[in-house]
Amino acid sequence: IWELKKDVYVVELDWYPDAPGEMVVLTCDTPEEDGITWTLDQSSEVLGSGKTLTIQVKEFGDAGQYTCHKGGEVLSHSLLLLHKKEDGIWSTDILKDQKEPKNKTFLRCEAKNYSGRFTCWWLTTISTDLTFSVKSSRGSSDPQGVTCGAATLSAERVRGDNKEYEYSVECQEDSACPAAEESLPIEVMVDAVHKLKYENYTSSFFIRDIIKPDPPKNLQLKPLKNSRQVEVSWEYPDTWSTPHSYFSLTFCVQVQGKSKREKKDRVFTDKTSATVICRKNASISVRAQDRYYSSSWSEWASVPCS
Amino acid sequence: RAVPGGSSPAWTQCQQLSQKLCTLAWSAHPLVGHMDLREEGDEETTNDVPHIQCGDGCDPQGLRDNSQFCLQRIHQGLIFYEKLLGSDIFTGEPSLLPDSPVGQLHASLLGLSQLLQPEGHHWETQQIPSLSPSQPWQRLLLRFKILRSLQAFVAVAARVFAHGAATLSP
């Protein structure tokens, strides 16, 4: 058993049929010695008396809010949550496996630049009685500070018969060094509590591996005289690290016909302009990627050829 | 050339060669979405590689103030990786494919380090740890980790030379 926060405790249980469970001793936080009784949740049934209560925790019916009283007055509470381990593996019932970029991916994180700011998100089908708490650091043995905000519900989607809820959190490394080569990964830890079930999820990454620039901005076309060619120009996104002479991007320019089956023409360039042939009903799209490190491409910025 | 005395390197040449190094490093060990190196083996085998750290002066301001600290650090790393790529880790079993980019990568690391330090000048270099695993799979794992680490190192070096070529070239 360990303390998650004040008066909230997590009992780790091997979860299999007829498992013996864990013996837990609760102590009433009071100077009083006599006349103390214990109850669980809203029930008035007295579970025991005395300053300590010993219980055998085997299932969710044994978890909940234990309260010690004296003469009708509440002295203290202890909330017991269960963390299940089945076949040596901690349960992952609360969050959905996003399966990208690989199986057992529950947390996904992205950064728009090298400033040390990043966003993580996760999915669940649970709509109520759900709380999350996020902690992060750089490195684990001698951790350096990363400050995370509160997790918030950022999107709701309907997936078949189910509703899916997306939660996200923003974090910022306290002493970020954008130009340095990272040697220790960022660690992100999410505590999830649904009713009386506790689970924790972790992710470990370098900022450089989760970089995804915003799309290029101010995408413009300038027709060239007496030609089907156009000059496409764009700018670095505002959110990208500066100076751009140091934090450089490379770009992919694509000409795509109306039909998805039509052949796509692609040009790669380090410049912020390119000359392409504009076909009727086609659109021109540009996306960006770090020039020197193959992290994710940005989403496309697009304009119609006409 | 970045001689220890403090003259400027051939920024544009260094920029071109460092960008080529980036391309080679990624073609030698391409990105695979579902691959997480921390899954490949628990033991941290590449802790001893030189990293370009915050105080090494490789940020834009540090380069403006005095690029020598940074260039020395880059040189140190290039020599270190060049030795690793020429070591038993890459020459032993399993054999490299005949058209492996590792040969070109090795030559380019040497080329860039020589651009930074001509013959006769010596910056101190870091000893490479004696890592020679006995099993072919351990050697392959080490190659993965070294190349992933090299990708991060050459990305910073390429940024330094691109910025130098754009802002510090005479």
């Epitope: 690989k102 | 030698a28 060990h29 391409p30 695979v32 579902h34 691959m35 899954e39 490949e40 890459f90 399993p94 054999s95 490299l96 494919l97 058209d99 492996s100 980019p101 590792v102 990568l105 099993q135 072919p136 799979w137 392959l140 794992l141 190659r143 993965f144 190349l147």
Partner: nanobody
């Protein structure tokens, strides 16, 4: 789900040659490592050869086939080949094609895999 289909097995005289092929169904081919294992009746599974495109690209052979067998690949066709020369009766076995997409070859070199085919029988008569 990667599916692997082997072909090219058969009966051959000692000293003869065979070429096995294995076609992979998925486009993840070049990000995986591919290899061959074999199993003779009543014997342990044995590593034969592997080829991969990560870590600089690599080829590796089991000790018993070194110098006689050659593994190669055609990425465009998602196909891996095993050219077997100077065949001996002890090469008789079912030959399985295998893919390691998660660890890019490390699993193959350790003697395991993510996926394998149904196998093709190779019989070498004396």
């Amino acid at each position: 789900e990667v599916q692997l289909v082997e072909s090219g097995g058969g009966l051959v005289q000692a000293g003869g040659s065979l070429r096995l092929s294995c076609v992979a169904s998925e486009r993840t081919f070049s990000s995986s490592a591919m290899g061959w294992f074999r199993q003779a009746p009543g014997k342990e599974r044995e590593f034969v050869a592997a080829i991969g495109w990560s870590g600089g690209g690599f080829i590796h052979y089991g000790d018993s086939v070194k110098g006689r067998f050659t593994i190669s690949a055609d990425n465009g066709k998602n196909t891996v080949y095993l050219q077997m020369n100077s065949l001996k009766p002890e090469d008789t076995a079912v030959y399985y094609c295998a893919a390691d997409s998660r660890l890019r070859g490390i699993a193959l070199l350790k003697g395991s895999y993510d996926y394998r085919g149904q196998g093709t029988q190779v019989t070498v008569s004396s």
